[in-house]
């Protein structure tokens, strides 16, 4: 069962309750005690699993990816799982921990020595919601820019948002992914009505910035469903 799979990853020995955010089972590695996260909350003591459901990697932390916790698990159940370290098996880049990428089914280091000059890399994009499979469109993409440890600036090729500088996210652009600006108040955003529809965009937008959400623009409420304009608005 899901419970038994996840209970084996229980986060133990956390600091005493302080009314804050808590770890979850996707992470086999216990969080370091006493670390403060953005927002200033510490974890709550919980000696059992806390699955964090997701549909895409962007909903998980930088050290996680979104997948079904069991091979033949419930179709609708995907949770954030701990990223795979170097030399571990993978099916896509997001499965590998930051500083690594998925090459020939193995997580390998993406330090600058591996990326000198122009390299050819397989980027497997999953266009459905089941990120734990290799179904979807797989294509070879040339990463023509050098990738260094410095965070990617706007327009830089990226694999995940953590590759990009602050204020940028990693979003699809044609058939590769580049760092694009996180959306500001009033900017047009994309509201995904249909499950998995984010995979169909070839010009993907970033998400709205802190304190903003993607909502129908007030003066567009009367418009037909297809022409409703969504913008980033204050909560």
């Amino acid at each position: 069962t899901l419970n038994s799979v996840l209970n084996s990853n229980a986060i133990k020995n956390l600091p005493p309750p302080l009314g804050g955010a808590a770890g979850h089972p996707g992470s086999a590695v216990s969080a370091a005690p006493g670390i403060l996260y953005p927002g200033g909350n510490k974890y709550q003591t919980i000696d059992n699993y806390q699955p964090y459901p997701c549909a895409e990697d962007e909903e998980c932390g930088t050290d996680e990816y979104c997948a079904s916790p069991t091979r033949g698990g419930d179709a609708g159940v995907q949770i954030c799982l701990a990223c795979r370290k170097r030399r571990k098996r993978c099916m896509r880049h997001a499965m590998c921990c930051p500083g690594n990428y998925c090459k020939n089914g193995i997580c390998v280091s993406s330090d600058q020595n591996h990326f000198r000059g122009e390299i050819e890399e397989t980027i497997t994009e999953s266009f459905g919601n089941d990120h734990s499979t290799l179904d979807g469109y797989s294509r070879r993409t040339t990463l023509s820019s050098k990738m260094y440890h410095t965070k990617g600036q706007e327009g830089s090729v990226c694999l995940r948002s953590s590759d990009c500088a602050s204020g940028l996210c990693c979003a699809r652009h044609f058939w590769s992914k580049i760092c694009k600006p996180v959306l500001k108040e009033g900017q047009v955003c994309t509201k995904h009505r249909r499950k998995g529809s984010h995979g169909l965009e070839i010009f993907q937008r970033c998400y709205c910035g802190e304190g903003l959400s993607c909502r129908i623009q007030k003066d567009h409420h009367q418009a037909s469903n297809s022409s409703r304009l969504h913008t980033c608005q204050r909560h």
Partner: nanobody, 124 residues
Framework: EVQLVESGGGLVQPGGSLRLSCAAS????????MGWFRQAPGKEREFVAA????????VYADSVKGRFTISADNSKNTAYLQMNSLKPEDTAVYYC?????????????????WGQGTLVTVSS
């Protein structure tokens, strides 16, 4: 910091139903995962159910599968837990939990922030 206020708890007979609500407000309501946890007297807090931001992925504890349904209304910044066929062993303080938004907000791991809880008592 997100403030979470649970409501809808109370006394119910075995086999009965309750609907818990959780209103989120404060610094941000991120519209990411929302969850429910519970803590029975003398026991550890345990996971009950959670739903992701789009509602496309839900996960339940085995003990509540088929009886409880989690849902969320992002436009109202509210999460719900519909509890049917309640049993005495469901008696607990139920806590709403809001996801932190994961990597979009700079977190290395997706985590929950907690409400104060609402008591649910199942007894005849």
């Amino acid at each position: 910091e997100v403030q979470l206020v649970e409501s809808g708890g109370g006394l119910v007979q075995p086999g009965g139903s309750l609907r818990l609500s959780c209103a989120a407000s404060g610094h941000t309501f991120r519209g990411y995962a929302m969850g429910w946890f519970r803590q029975a007297p003398g026991k550890e807090r345990e996971f009950v159910a959670a739903i992701n931001r789009s509602g496309s992925s839900t996960v339940y504890a085995d003990s509540v599968k088929g009886r409880f349904t989690i849902s969320a209304d992002n436009s109202k910044n509210t999460a719900y837990l519909q509890m049917n066929s309640l049993k005495p062993e469901d008696t607990a303080v139920y806590y709403c939990a809001a996801g932190n938004g994961g990597r979009a907000y700079g977190y290395s791991r997706a985590r929950y922030e907690w409400g104060q809880g609402t008591l649910v008592t199942v007894s005849s």
